[in-house]
Each structure stands twice: as structure tokens, then as C-alpha cells.
């Protein structure tokens, strides 16, 4: 009886794992083995595919074959018993194009209200992704084990920290990789779960802001308790993208080590041009807080995003605010040639109730004010570009009294 060729050959490539699967053509014939040949582009001869010779099952692995993953190859298969079937040719393919990204490795660390996620490619030193190692981005799905309500986080790198979680709570997550340059989305990792710790005695510092004063950076933060010491550390932001390395060498800012105030001042030349991460930690001598949320600090933007300067024209029921370019030392205006949006906060001098206006224009009306009342105004600028999502610090507050009634015209 003539042997039939195997059919429906599927090539599955995940990272550097090359798997072939096929269907037997004739289930009734026993003791049949299968063999593959391959052919590279531009070659006439067929070569035996090592790892896929005389296979008794309907699956084989040819990962050991050192292929150029960007080069097209062709495969053929036949069945063998006493005689052999005709060859069945598989459509030619390029391994890189066919390859899927495998599940990444995930390492979790817990704090009381945060989880640190370290992500590594599933295959270390992968040949398939050798040229793309630094281009991987990741996305994750996270949920409270008790509720199952999922939150998706996109476009993260090999280290990511999720904040504002609940203490003593189990969170579960799964991660997948993507190579956006090649339109490839990977396979999810297994689900990993971790329980956040009991609430720490000392909370981390909050609301970290960087501003520029003369030739210095001023770093400010808020803290709940008095009589604390603080330290500040920085890290090059690009190091979060380093796929294999999970040793993050955070550096101390010398002028911000063991400071007793909720701010520190350090020279601009501490940082070369670049994007950095900053974090602050509090200590009372016995206990230490976890690190604050990491803020992104771009020296380029920081250097030129100064608080706006404004003038107020007071009427009885409104202020007209005219926003001008901020002044550098030496009173020269700073030219800011990128679109800004202005946030204006105003409040009655005798009250803490703040109201907010967001405006793109540089002349703004603050309506619905009471006559003969002192109002205070402060403003800050935000970049409108999402990638350079940056804010200046607030200007100093300016307080003015509204005019008597009937002067609004």
C-alpha cells in the first residue's frame, strides 16, 4: 500500500523554540515515522532537518538548528515505513516574521501599598530578538485576588512600580511583551500573585516637585510628621528599559542626604542633560519609610518650564489676568516656543476654598467675584505635549481687592 504524505503542517515559533506539528494522513497504518528536510533561499539542495528525522509522533523540535532568522526557509515532510510517501512541501516562511514573543519572566516585590514588578524576556540571550532586546515594551493586567476586577497598564518597561494599593491584600497579575516596531504582541506570562505587607509605621514622602531657582534645582515634598530626616536618590530613566539587569544603582544626591527639612537645594550641574527618576525616603532614626513614588525629571524641560508671570486688572465682579513670559535672573523674558496650558488657582483671602481655571489663552477672566473683597491668585504652566508631560511650579500668590460695585463695564 502506498503511504500518503502527511498534511496540515504547522510551524510554531515562540522565542527561540521552533516546533513543527502535522497530521497523519492515514491513522490505520502503524509504525510510521516522519522526516523533514529544509532548504534555504537561493539553494537547490535539500538538507536533513536535525531533530526532525524518523519521528514517531506528530511533533518535533528543530530549535537546535542555527538559522538566520531573517532568511526565508522552506520545509518538506514525508512519511516512512518500508517505503516512503511523496514529499509534502510546506509554504516557505521567514522565522522572524512567524515568531511569537513568549511569556516574559516576572519577579515581584511587595511593600505595604505598592508592588515592584521586574520583567525579563522569557528566553535569555534570545537569537530571535537579539536586535530588538531594548525595544520590548510590556503590558500587564492586575487585579485584587478577592474581587477579580481587572486593571490594564500599557507601555511599561522592565521595571515598573504600582502605587496606591491596599496593605495586606493579595494582588495577581500577568504580563505580556510587545515589539511595536514589528507589530508583535506576545503571550501572557503565568499569573503571579503577591500579598502587600502590613502598613508601614512611616508613610513615604508625597507630592515631590522640582523647580529651578537661579543655578539650582529645588526639590520639595510633603511629609506627615515633623522631626524626620530625608534622603533623595536618582536613577537614569533609561535603566528601567534594560531587559536583563535588575540591579538598579540608585545614586544619592549629596546635598539631599540626611536633610531635616522637606526640601533640598542642589546645583544644576549635578545632572547632565537627560531624563532621571527621583525618589525620597523618610526616617525617624529608628524606622524608615518605603521610597516615595518615583517622579520623572527631565533636565531639558525643567530648565525651561518656569512659572508664568501675570498682571491682574481688578473689576468689581471679576479679575482680568494677563499672562506673560516668565523672567530669568537678569529680568530677561524666557522664550518658550512650545504650546502651554495655564492652570490658575484663586481663592478669597479669608477662605481656604480654592477654585481652578484651566486656559490655553494668555488673557483670562476670573468671573463671579464679590466686590471689595481680597482674592489671591497663583498660576502654573503645563506642557500640552503628552510625551513631555511637565508642569512648572506655581508662581507666588498675588492678592488684589476687587473694585466697588458697578465697575464691571
Amino acid at each position: 500500500k502506498n503511504l500518503k504524505s502527511p498534511q496540515k503542517v504547522e510551524v510554531d515559533i515562540i522565542d527561540d523554540n521552533f516546533i513543527l506539528r502535522w497530521n497523519r494522513s492515514d491513522e490505520s497504518v502503524g509504525n510510521v515515522t516522519f522526516s523533514f528536510d529544509y532548504q534555504k533561499t537561493g539553494m537547490d539542495n535539500w538538507i536533513k532537518l536535525s531533530g526532525c528525522q524518523n519521528i514517531t509522533s506528530t511533533k518535533c523540535n528543530f530549535s537546535s538548528l542555527k538559522l538566520n532568522v531573517y532568511e526565508e526557509i522552506k520545509l518538506r515532510i514525508r512519511a516512512e515505513k518500508e517505503n516512503t510517501s511523496s514529499w509534502y512541501e510546506v509554504d516557505s516562511f521567514t522565522p522572524f516574521r512567524k515568531a511569537q514573543i513568549g511569556p516574559p519572566e516576572v519577579h515581584l516585590e511587595a511593600e505595604d501599598k505598592a508592588i515592584v514588578i521586574h520583567i525579563s524576556p522569557g528566553t535569555k540571550d534570545s537569537v530571535m530578538w537579539a536586535l530588538d532586546g531594548l525595544s520590548f515594551t510590556y503590558s500587564l493586567v492586575i487585579w485584587k485576588n478577592s474581587s477579580g476586577v481587572e486593571e490594564r497598564i500599557e507601555n511599561i518597561y522592565s521595571r515598573h512600580k504600582i502605587y496606591k494599593l491596599s496593605p495586606e491584600t493579595t494582588y495577581c497579575l500577568k504580563v505580556k511583551a510587545a515589539l511595536l516596531t514589528s507589530w508583535k504582541i506576545g503571550v501572557y506570562s503565568p499569573v503571579h500573585c503577591i500579598k502587600t505587607t502590613v502598613e508601614n509605621e512611616l508613610p513615604p514622602p508625597e507630592n515631590i516637585e522640582v523647580s529651578v531657582q537661579n543655578q539650582n534645582y529645588v526639590l520639595k515634598w510633603d511629609y506627615t510628621y515633623a522631626n524626620m530626616t530625608f534622603q533623595v536618590q536618582w536613577l537614569h530613566a533609561f535603566l528601567k528599559r534594560n531587559p536583563g539587569n535588575h540591579l538598579y544603582k540608585w545614586k544619592q544626591i549629596p546635598d539631599c542626604e540626611n536633610v531635616k527639612t522637606t526640601q533640598c537645594v542642589f546645583p544644576q550641574n549635578v545632572f547632565q542633560k537627560g531624563i532621571y527618576l527621583l525618589r525620597v525616603q523618610a526616617s525617624d532614626g529608628n524606622n524608615t519609610s518605603f521610597w516615595s513614588e518615583e517622579i520623572k525629571f527631565d533636565t531639558e524641560i525643567q530648565a525651561f518650564l518656569l512659572p508664568p508671570v501675570f498682571n491682574i486688572r481688578s473689576l468689581s465682579d471679576s479679575f482680568h489676568i494677563y499672562i506673560g513670559a516668565p523672567k530669568q535672573s537678569g529680568n530677561t523674558p524666557v522664550i518658550q516656543d512650545y504650546p502651554l496650558i495655564y492652570e490658575i488657582i484663586f481663592w478669597e483671602n479669608t477662605s481656604n476654598a480654592e477654585r481652578k481655571i484651566i486656559e490655553k489663552k494668555t488673557d483670562v477672566t476670573v468671573p463671579n467675584l464679590k466686590p471689595l473683597t481680597v482674592y489671591c491668585v497663583k498660576a502654573r504652566a503645563h506642557t500640552m505635549d503628552e510625551k513631555l508631560n511637565k508642569s512648572s511650579v506655581f508662581s507666588d500668590a498675588v492678592c488684589e481687592k476687587t473694585k466697588p460695585g458697578n465697575t464691571s463695564k
Partner: antibody, heavy 118, light 107 residues
Framework: EVQLQQSGAKLVKPGASVKLSCTAS????????MCWVKQRTEQGLEWIGR????????KYAPKFQGKATITADTSSNTASLQLSSLTSEDTAVYYC???????????WGQGTSVTVSS | DTVMTQSQKFMSTSVGDRVSVTCKAS??????VAWYQQKPGQSPKALIY???YRYSGVPDRFTGSGSGTDFTLTISNVQSEDLAEYFC?????????FGGGTKLEIK
């Protein structure tokens, strides 16, 4: 294969200084922290300090501030520990270790025995 | 500095048993705890990092657990070659600290 080879045993007089070395192979010390740990006979482990060989930044446990000085030479892939004003309390085995991923010490040297005696 | 306390200096167990070595931190260190094994006359060997992660080559009978201030190293199906001293260490802050060690004796 990652290995940390430490210098041989030292016998030194009280008040003197001693310098111990730790030569790494199988990895570049610039990519890691290099740590030093002290262990006295039949006692526990004490972390002395660490260096980032990439820029020379050091950090010491308060107890060893002024006593220990850690340096690194990236050209020879070597970290060193200098101990000054030695007393009998400094008699111990000193280990170098690599500060690896997630800050844990993943590889250790074989240890160097330092005996302070007149 | 964070103090790491291993309250049991000695523990006695038999081959095939399950034993748990405990370690308590004086303050919350998250999950930044490592465990080391030191056999007589040898240098320490890393077993566990980040409280629960086993180094490659470490037998899966070694398991780490815990977070915050309380940590445990469990050895299931104890073997004679597990006769050693076990140290915990916090790697949460720059000034790492070790526990005093727990010596495991095999009956």
C-alpha cells in the same frame, strides 16, 4: 562561570593596616555592586559595606565607617578592602560577595582569614 | 539600622523531616529578604532572594516565605547535606543586615 578569588591569609600586628583583594572572573564588576562581609570565629555575618565599581561610590555600615575602605579597579576586575588601626577585634574571616539582581549577594569568595596578633 | 533576629540559634531535625527557620525584622522590609546557607568550613551560599525566589541550582526543597517583618525558610525532606548554618539578611536598604544565624543539626 562566575568566581570570586580572594587573596591569602594575613597575619598583622595591632595598629597596622591590611589590604585584602577579591578578583572576579566570569562577569564585569562594573555591572554589579561588590560587597564585603566580616565573620568572626563561631559568630554571625556582618555587612561591612559595598562599592559601585562603575563610579567608585561606596556605602558603609555605621560600625565600619572609618575602619574600612573599599576600592575597586575595573581594569583588573578587582575589589579591595583596606582595614586600618587593627585590633584583636578585627581578627576574622572577610568575604567578598557580588551584589547582584535585586540587591542580594549571589556569589561569594572563599574568604580571607586576618589574624591580628603581636 | 534594621535589626534581623533569628531567635533559634540551634535546631535539631532528622533526615526526611520538614523544618522551618524563622527571622524577624525590626521594621517592615517589604519582601527584600535573602537566605544564605553556610556549611562548616565553607563560605556562605545564596539560597533565596526577595523572600520567596530560589536561586538556580538550589533544590526545590528550600522554600522562602513571608513579608513585612516575619520571614521563614522551610526545608522539606531534610537531607544530611543540609547540615549547615542558615542566615537571613535584609536587602531593603543600603545598610544590609544579617540575622545571627540558625545552626541546623541532623539527629
Amino acid at each position: 562561570e562566575v568566581q570570586l578569588q580572594q587573596s591569602g591569609a594575613k597575619l598583622v600586628k595591632p595598629g597596622a593596616s591590611v589590604k585584602l583583594s577579591c578578583t572576579a572572573s566570569g562577569f564585569n564588576i562594573k555591572d554589579y555592586y561588590m560587597c564585603w562581609v566580616k565573620q568572626r570565629t563561631e559568630q554571625g555575618l556582618e555587612w561591612i559595606g559595598r562599592i559601585d565599581p562603575e563610579d567608585g561610590e561606596t556605602k558603609y555600615a555605621p560600625k565600619f565607617q572609618g575602619k574600612a575602605t573599599i576600592t575597586a579597579d575595573t581594569s583588573s576586575n578587582t575589589a579591595s578592602l583596606q582595614l586600618s588601626s587593627l585590633t584583636s577585634e578585627d581578627t576574622a574571616v572577610y568575604y567578598c560577595a557580588r551584589g547582584g539582581n535585586y540587591y542580594a549577594m549571589d556569589y561569594w569568595g572563599q574568604g580571607t582569614s586576618v589574624t591580628v596578633s603581636s | 539600622d534594621t535589626v534581623m533576629t533569628q531567635s533559634q540559634k540551634f535546631m535539631s531535625t532528622s533526615v526526611g523531616d520538614r523544618v522551618s527557620v524563622t527571622c524577624k525584622a525590626s521594621q517592615n522590609v517589604g519582601t527584600n529578604v535573602a537566605w544564605y546557607q553556610q556549611k562548616p568550613g565553607q563560605s556562605p551560599k545564596a539560597l533565596i532572594y526577595s523572600a520567596t525566589y530560589r536561586y538556580s541550582g538550589v533544590p526545590d526543597r528550600f522554600t522562602g516565605s513571608g513579608s513585612g517583618t516575619d520571614f521563614t525558610l522551610t526545608i522539606s525532606n531534610v537531607q544530611s547535606e543540609d547540615l549547615a548554618e542558615y542566615f537571613c539578611q535584609q536587602h531593603n536598604s543600603y545598610s544590609y543586615t544579617f540575622g545571627g544565624g540558625t545552626k541546623l543539626e541532623i539527629k
